[in-house]
Amino acid sequence: CDLPQTHSLGNRRALILLAQMGRISHFSCLKDRHDFGFPEEEFDGHQFQKAQAISVLHEMIQQTFNLFSTEDSSAAWEQSLLEKFSTELYQQLNDLEACVIQEVGVEETPLMNEDSILAVRKYFQRITLYLTEKKYSPCAWEVVRAEIMRSLSFSTNLQKRLRRKD
């Protein structure tokens, strides 16, 4: 399955929008910094096939979309930027979904890498618990915004590598 060229443009737009969403100086939130243990090994693109990588990417974008679709998120960010960001993520989900569906229909496609899906889910669990613990404070959201920029960058890089494999 080939992701459309517009998909990589959407990736970049999402990153730009997320950068623009920053409201407070990252430096004023240094005390709130946290290591969420991003599962880098799931995004190096070496240890599994394209079909499995796309499932992991889908999980990553879906969890990001869900995180920024909560009421707490709506209260934290400027509404029009948040809506544009969510729209970009939604479009990416549609592209990835079409690819996964195509792979599901292929009998010889290897099984989904369950542990990779779980690793992504656990990563977002850590982010969710951090926000809950910090009572969704502005600084907590800023730390999370910076973290998601990092994770989306990893996703973008993995997608580039997958395109080069084709």
């Epitope: 499932s55 889908h58 999980e59 879906q62 969890q63 979309f65 869900n66 679709s69 989900l93 990835l96 979904e97 996964v100 569906i101 599901v104 989904m112 369950e114 542990d115 779980l118 889910r121 656990k122 977002f124 669990q125 850590r126 969710t128 618990l129 809950t132």
Partner: antibody
Framework: QVQLQQPGAELVKPGASVKLSCKAS????????MHWVKQRPGQGLEWIGE????????IYNENFKSKATLTVDKSSITAFMQLSSLTSEDSAVYFC????????????WGQGTLVTVSA | QIVLTQSPAIMSASPGEKVTLTCSAG???????LYWYQQKPGSSPKLWIY???NLASGVPARFSGSGSGTSYSLTISSMEAEDAASYFC?????????FGSGTKLEIK
Amino acid sequence: QVQLQQPGAELVKPGASVKLSCKASGYTFTNYWMHWVKQRPGQGLEWIGEINPSHGRTIYNENFKSKATLTVDKSSITAFMQLSSLTSEDSAVYFCARGGLGPAWFAYWGQGTLVTVSA
Amino acid sequence: QIVLTQSPAIMSASPGEKVTLTCSAGSSVDSSYLYWYQQKPGSSPKLWIYSTSNLASGVPARFSGSGSGTSYSLTISSMEAEDAASYFCHQWSSYPFTFGSGTKLEIK
């Protein structure tokens, strides 16, 4: 509000199959994995597996791989679980439960469908 | 798979009594992925405690959860009649996800 609707009961004969349904409402169906859980009368809970309604990918408990098949119909926002080659061991209440994170993990359950396998 | 063993299987407590239910894991479980559910007869399970120690919405403050590694517990500081139910621990730290066999808590 989030709701998962399941039929109350199904009576089936040994060796037959049954397809259980779980109709979702109050949230975007394709955004969350749907899980299925088995509970035998007076017993604990067993996780059967999960399905992502967005693309249909499934993850199963090895113990249920040859017993259960999970599917979804996005148009009717319904998740299904087919149970095959039924025996008395399959007589149980089957719940669907929505995935999520933090305080939303299995925070929403269907009422459960009682499956009775009897000749 | 990670086996969760709950003890005792059944217990009864008087109103006002302190109650502790335990959940022992066959191998280590990260505390972030250890949950507790309450179930009353004829009803579906209800999320009660998430990530070891966080009370779900609407759960009375007399409940608390603690633990790490292979040993977890749910405590009721002062038993009330409405607390009579079955309690299940659950882990989603690794596949397949598992539940404990449950503790049925009765009121004396």
